[in-house]
Interface confidence: medium
């Protein structure tokens, strides 16, 4: 417990102290006072640096004195031998004897009382930043007029915060400029400007005077900008030296002017303004900026178009333009969207063909469509190949989106039909040297395949069958075969209008118009055994004049049986009309003269004993086209004759191509579109 | 495909606050910025502010400074919104949308009501 | 910020009928105007985007028109599916702001 004062005196004074004694006491006043400690008496071994027997006295670590010996006052008014003065408040004194004293010594007597210290004077630092008052006890700090005492109760500073500025143009200056600014003090001012524009500070080199830096470069007092998470500075020194114009980047700054305790500088002036917010000028190779500026700033908006072939994707859709608008943050709007290039995706695929795996998909890439050659040919012309387009769609060379369409190559046999020998008279043949032969099972009788979903056949074979069974690529029709072949089945049968119903069909003697079209109801895929023939063209060159060799082929009947199970064909010459008109009919069941010729039929046939017969009806009678001798066109279509392995008659195909095409039109399949 | 799911209803009493979250899946958030938009009972749809989750910029309407937060976790693709000081006038469904050009899509929303 | 007014605020129509709603805004938004439909119960969906553009989905018996200021939605035929209400909303620059939406409701 603080006391104010005290005595302290040595272990049995007055008697002699005993050898080998430690003895120490701890004295304290109450804060803000000094002690001063006083001996009236000394009676101590003497030693040198008192190494012996000693009082020490202590003020924390530091020893403030030690004593032995003996002393005697040096003024007859007052009784003190020795004293100590201290601005603290608490002391210890030690008292050491060793093991042995030659004579006898009396130890000591000391005082202590509690004295008022001078704060304001007795300290090398100064406690208070100006005016410093002492009372007993403890001091207080005042501060000059217009100054204010800070929280620390000791240091004075200028009251020069909180004032904030949100006019778009202003001047700030430090305190009393331009006299000296005041010592020890922290300035703090606030610029806040509306959203959307930054805070530009302009410094004149000439209005700066501030206490230079130390040795170390460390500014004794500050001028710092902060903006957000941007400094500007600490800048001192005479002159301003950082940048005459301070763009912050942002609406709010914060200026804060920071002083130590002297110097005579006059300190600063500077002026802002608020700039919009300027944000960057993006130059991009994909898209166009409008208008176009040198500089964009808040509130500027931009319509950004994607350049021919690039697009902005979003969700499930892609737009080639949007606009943009400068934010109050520096920042444009919508800055996610980004012209990419136009993705075509993954090219569709084509029946009867096939399509490249493009390297990639997007904008410009190339892909190629082939078709199934040599089955197969591209309609169009074109050699196939696509790139992708500026919107998004794969086209061709033509720019346009539609699909190749890969169609059958018609006329052409794998093998050509080398029969030398002499249906009846003719040879084996095999189905690759005839892959349009279509085999009817009921009633027993041909046809010629003439496009993936249509077969022509003779009117007279389908007219007692609406559903017809078919067969291709195949040329044997033993049972066992037609079971590995193709079987074709009928959606609808179309017999030609101008085909007269009978009702007997046996007794028949007009075959004028004997043409049908069977519509399949699923399309035929070619091969080696299986393509189409092709229709005669319009011109004249498709007109067949007597001699012009046609093949046909067939299961029909031959000299040696009803039936054929293996394919038979024969070379057969067009003979004039009246040939056919000579031969004697052979049918009890009809009146020979009453037969008709028209100009719907051809005669061929007479040479060799080759010829068409029953089982053979609906076949092709195939002729080289004039304009490409590789390919085959349906020049005939086997019909009817007056007696076998004479001359035949065969429906005049060129006579029905418009009525075979419209057809064929009108019926179309949608999936074939 | 994309998909957002927002966390369940919350009650709160008025003056607490109340944090809603939206998990994005089927794309990355950082490509996109993530908004917040309310609708009280009967009443319109309000934007209340986007953050773009690449930087973590948020920006706010001014009926809802000082008392919103937007924030975004980009490691599990999620995005935040925060509402402060709850007075029964913030009784709304709070949907989640994201947007580059247009809000493609939404949250099924969820319905925050405050009440003492 | 911008004012986004629609009208009518609700309307009553009938099946197979053709719907216009119209939008204001109280200042140019060139074109970054978007239409939203939303079912009770349901988050909003989007029809149209900048202005004029059907998002992918949407049949075509929407249709949005206009630039600067003024703006339609039109339904060329009403289906029963599409009563329901719509909202418009600027996005040229922020706060995005609303309509107050067209209620539209069977007749």
């Known amino acids: 417990e603080p006391t104010m004062y005290g005595e302290i005196l040595s272990p049995n004074y007055p008697q002699a102290y005993p050898s080998e004694v430690e003895k120490s006491w701890d004295i304290e006043v109450p804060e803000g006072y000094g002690i001063h400690l006083y001996f009236t008496h000394l009676d101590i071994e003497l030693s040198e640096n008192c190494a012996y027997d000693s009082v020490q006295i202590m003020s924390g670590d530091i020893e403030e004195g030690r004593l032995c010996g003996q002393r005697t006052s040096n003024n007859p008014h007052s009784p003190i031998v020795e004293e100590f003065q201290v601005p603290y408040n608490k002391l210890q004194v030690i008292f050491k004897s060793d093991f042995s004293n030659e004579e006898r010594f009396t130890g000591f007597a000391a005082y202590y009382v509690a004295t008022d210290i001078n704060e304001c004077t007795d300290f090398v630092d100064a406690p208070c930043s100006h005016f410093c008052n002492n009372f007993i006890g403890g001091y207080f700090c005042s501060c000059p007029p217009e100054y204010f005492l800070h929280d620390d109760m000791k240091n004075c500073g200028v009251n020069c915060s909180g004032d904030v500025f949100t006019a778009l143009i202003g001047e700030i200056a430090s305190p009393n400029y331009p006299k000296p600014y005041p010592e020890n003090s922290r300035c703090e001012y606030q610029i806040r400007l509306e959203k959307g524009f930054q805070v530009v500070v302009t410094v004149r080199r000439e209005d700066f005077d501030v206490e230079p830096a130390d040795s170390e470069g460390n500014c004794l007092d500050s001028l710092v900008f902060v903006a957000g998470d941007q400094q500007f500075g600490p800048y001192c020194g005479r002159g301003f030296p950082g940048p005459l114009n301070i763009e912050t980047k942002s609406n709010a700054l914060d200026i804060i002017f920071q002083t130590d305790l002297t110097g005579q500088n006059k300190g600063w002036k500077l002026r802002y303004h608020g700039d919009p917010m300027p944000c960057p000028k993006e130059e991009t190779p994909t898209s166009v900026w409008e208008p176009a500026k040198a500089k964009y700033v808040f509130r500027d908006v931009v319509r950004i178009t994607c350049l021919d072939g690039f697009e902005v994707v979003e969700g499930r859709v892609g737009a080639t333009s949007f606009h943009s608008t400068c934010q109050s943050n520096g920042k444009w709007s919508n800055s996610k969207l980004k012209c990419q290039p136009v993705d075509c995706g993954i090219p569709e695929s084509i029946e009867n063909g096939k399509v490249e795996d493009p390297e990639s998909t997007l904008f410009g890439s190339v892909t190629r469509y082939t078709c199934e050659e040599p089955y197969y040919y591209m309609e169009n012309g074109g050699n196939g190949q696509y790139h992708c387009a500026s919107n998004g769609s794969w086209v061709n060379e033509a720019l346009s989106p539609e699909l190749p369409k890969c169609v059958p190559v018609c006329g052409v046999p794998r093998e050509p039909f080398e029969g030398k020998q002499r249906i009846i008279g003719g040879s084996d043949a095999d189905i690759k040297n005839f892959p349009w032969q279509v085999f009817f099972d009921n009633p027993w009788a041909g046809g010629a395949l003439i496009d993936e979903y249509w077969v022509l056949t003779a009117a007279h074979v389908v007219e007692g069958n609406q559903e017809p069974t078919m067969y291709v690529g195949s040329t044997s029709v033993q049972t066992s075969r037609l079971a590995k072949s193709k079987m074709l089945t009928s959606e609808r049968v179309f017999i030609h209008p101008g085909w007269k119903l009978l009702e007997v069909p046996e007794a028949r003697t007009n075959f004028d118009n004997d043409i049908a079209l069977v519509q399949l109801k699923d399309p035929v895929k070619m091969g080696p055994t299986v393509a189409p023939i092709c229709l005669p063209g319009t011109s004249s060159d498709y007109n067949l004049m007597d001699g012009d060799l046609g093949l046909i082929a067939g299961w029909g009947r031959t000299e040696k049986r009803d039936r054929a199970l293996r394919l038979k064909a024969a070379r057969l010459p067009v003979a004039p009309l009246r040939k056919c008109r000579e031969v004697k009919v052979e049918n009890p069941k009809a009146d020979a003269g009453a037969y008709v010729f028209t100009p719907n039929m051809i005669c061929a046939g007479g040479e060799k004993g080759m010829d068409s017969c029953k089982g053979d009806s609906g076949g092709a009678f195939a002729v080289q086209d004039p304009n490409d001798k590789a390919k085959f066109y349906v020049a005939g279509l086997v019909s009817w004759g007056p007696q076998c392995g004479t001359y035949g008659l065969y429906t005049r195909v060129q006579n029905y191509v418009d009525w075979i095409k419209k057809t064929m039109q009108e019926n179309s399949t949608p999936s074939k579109d | 495909q994309v998909q957002l799911v927002q966390s369940g209803a919350e009650v709160k009493k008025p003056g607490a606050s109340v944090k809603v979250s939206c998990k994005a899946s089927g794309f990355n958030i950082k490509e996109y910025y993530m908004h917040w938009v309310r609708q009280a009972p009967e009443q319109g749809l309000e934007w209340m502010g986007w953050?773009?989750?690449?930087?973590?910029?948020?920006i706010y309407a001014q009926k809802f400074q000082g008392r919103v937060t937007i924030t975004a976790d980009t490691s599990t693709n999620t995005a935040y919104m925060e509402l402060s000081s709850l007075r029964s006038e913030d009784t709304a469904v709070y949907y989640c949308a994201r947007s580059r050009l247009f809000f493609a899509y939404w949250g099924q929303g969820t319905l925050v009501t405050v009440s003492s | 910020d911008i004012q986004m007014t629609q009208s009518p605020k609700s309307l009553s129509a009938s099946v197979g009928d053709r719907v216009t709603i119209t939008c204001r805004a109280s200042?140019?938004?060139?074109?970054?105007l978007d239409w939203y439909q939303q079912k009770p119960g349901q988050s909003p969906k989007l029809l149209i985007y900048?202005?004029?553009y059907r998002y992918s989905g949407v049949p075509s018996r929407f249709s949005g028109s206009g630039s600067g200021t003024d703006f339609t939605l039109t339904i060329s035929s009403l289906q029963p599916e599409d009563f329901a209400t719509y909202y418009c909303q600027q996005q040229y620059t922020t706060p995005y702001t609303f309509g107050q939406g067209t209620k539209l409701e069977i007749k």
């Open positions: 953050i773009d989750p690449e930087n973590a910029d948020a």
């Open positions: 200042q140019d938004v060139r074109t970054a």
């Open positions: 900048s202005a004029s």
